[in-house]
Interface confidence: low
């Protein structure tokens, strides 16, 4: 096929004007998989444009996408997950541009959740834990996680730690004392599946302890009530006398 559409306003449009990108999410809704595509140029007039996927499907030759505002979306169990599918932008029966894509190489995991940070006073460290729905999945089970944290006042100075488990220990001495930190986590497929980073989890905020001259720490971190903190500080002052 030529690179030009043959109807009306679109007849001078070049293929490149319709470049798009897609990501898949496997077992995103029970046993259903999803595929989401969008045009890379936000100014494309999408009024009459449709997306269709053909090949590497179970029982059907092709499936049509639903249009949701600016994105195109399919939720189905019909992805074979072996071999490449042909994804086309269509106007009527005419294909404007197509891409051959193996859906297992464009997987975007679901965002991690339940991120929390607990301070261990005896160990002088912070235990970071989070959860991921992928632990229960059949396909995309193995993920690499990217934990990012920063001192709240440092706008762009994020420290990143990559890990394959859902638990991380941050040593207190590596963090600034009496500082508020923001932490978040995202995931990417590892092992057989390939693809993109998930969305970031919601951020979690925690405070590091102050360093006191004699007794070392005060409880000025985490969700501790002001009354307990005041009692603790009185106790520390009495110890100093």
């Amino acid at each position: 096929e030529s690179g030009y559409a043959q109807n009306g306003d679109l007849e001078d449009a070049e293929l490149d004007d319709y470049s798009f990108s897609c990501y898949s999410q496997l077992e995103v809704n029970g046993s259903q998989h999803s595929l989401t595509c969008a045009f890379e140029d936000p100014d494309v007039n999408i009024t009459n444009l449709e997306f269709e996927i053909c090949g590497a499907l179970v029982e059907v030759k092709c499936l049509n996408f639903r249009k949701l505002q600016e994105i195109y979306f399919i939720e189905t169990k019909k992805f074979l997950l072996i071999g490449k599918s042909n994804i086309c932008v269509k106007v009527g029966e005419k294909s404007l541009t197509c891409k051959k894509i193996d859906l297992t190489t464009i997987v975007k995991p679901e965002a991690p959740f339940d991120l929390s940070v607990v301070y261990r006073e005896g160990a002088n460290d912070f235990v970071v834990t989070f959860n991921t729905s992928h632990l229960q999945k059949k396909y995309v089970k193995v993920l690499m996680h990217d934990v990012a944290y920063r001192q709240e006042k440092d706008e762009n100075k994020w420290t990143h730690v990559n890990l394959s488990s859902t638990k991380l220990t941050l040593l207190q001495r590596k963090l600034q004392p009496a500082a508020m930190y923001e932490i978040k986590v995202r995931s990417i497929p590892d092992h057989y599946f390939k693809g993109f980073w998930s969305e970031w989890s919601p951020s979690y905020y925690f405070r590091t302890p102050e360093i006191n001259n004699s007794s070392g720490l005060s409880l000025s971190y985490g969700p501790v009530s002001p009354i307990i903190r005041r009692l603790w500080n009185i106790f520390v002052r009495n110890q100093e006398k």
């Epitope: 077992e27 029970g30 046993s31 259903q32 449709e50 179970v58 029982e59 059907v60 499936l63 049509n64 996408f65 639903r66 249009k67 939720e75 189905t76 169990k77 019909k78 059949k138």
Partner: antibody, heavy 120, light 112 residues
Framework: QVQLQQSGAELARPGASVKLSCKAS????????ISWVKQRTGQGLEWFGE????????YYNEKFKVKATLTADKSSSTAYMELRSLTSEDSAVYFC?????????????WGQGTSVTVSS | DVVMTQTPLSLPVSLGDQASISCRSS???????????LYWYLQKPGQSPKVLIY???NRFSGVPDRFSGSGSGTDFTLKISRVEAEDLGVYFC?????????FGGGTKLEIK
């Protein structure tokens, strides 16, 4: 080839319950749903609901939600429908059918049907 | 619920004739994704239904090309170009666009 083997005919008293089974073979059981359909003698077809065995998610026709419970056993590739508080209105043939993603195939392969007779 | 009305109730035909069955829905069967989930099934005496046509006009695998489906919105038609003895039975239309899924009342195709 795809096959759905349903359990044998049931004779039940009013007020009792019955549990119908539907054993699937010839395809990956957890990759599809199982729908249940009712057909009274000489009458039309009514969709009861659908279960997705992998997740256990169920989707009922509200009309039959209190009448039926859908379950599935992945290890034996078998789906079940329990009918409770039986009345003469429940006397019918019940079919199970493989259902693809809700909006593509609906129900493509069907079991042979199980006859349920409610009589005192 | 979407009501599916089939006509005629009974259709006497001679072998080799063309047969046409109509199905009308109480609301549009065009899904929000642009597809129309209208199906046709054939149920022979003592058997379970078999799918003939999916999404208005697509023949299911193994279905002879004498069967064709057409229509849009709320009005749909199943045509059999040359009726054969094995085509006799009850034909049901079915919609999978709106939950609960619903069937038409059936059309019995019989020999004149």
């Amino acid at each position: 080839q795809v096959q759905l083997q349903q359990s044998g005919a049931e004779l039940a008293r009013p007020g009792a319950s019955v549990k119908l089974s539907c054993k699937a073979s010839g395809y990956t059981f957890t990759s599809y749903g199982i729908s249940w359909v009712k057909q009274r003698t000489g009458q039309g077809l009514e969709w009861f609901g659908e279960i997705y065995p992998r997740s256990g998610n169920t989707y009922y026709n509200e009309k039959f939600k209190v009448k039926a419970t859908l379950t599935a056993d992945k290890s034996s590739s078998t789906a079940y429908m329990e009918l409770r508080s039986l009345t003469s209105e429940d006397s019918a043939v019940y079919f199970c059918a493989r259902s693809g993603p809700p909006y593509y195939y609906a129900m493509d392969y069907w079991g042979q049907g199980t006859s349920v007779t409610v009589s005192s | 619920d979407v009501v599916m009305t089939q006509t005629p109730l009974s259709l006497p035909v001679s072998l080799g004739d063309q047969a046409s069955i109509s199905c009308r829905s109480s609301q549009s069967l065009v899904h929000s994704n642009g597809n129309t989930y209208l199906y046709w099934y054939l149920q022979k005496p003592g058997q379970s239904p078999k799918v003939l046509i999916y999404r208005v006009s697509n023949r299911f695998s193994g279905v002879p090309d004498r069967f064709s489906g057409s229509g849009s919105g709320t009005d749909f038609t199943l045509k059999i170009s040359r009726v054969e003895a094995e085509d006799l039975g009850v034909y049901f239309c079915f919609q999978g666009t709106h939950v609960p899924w619903t069937f038409g009342g059936g059309t019995k195709l019989e020999i004149k």
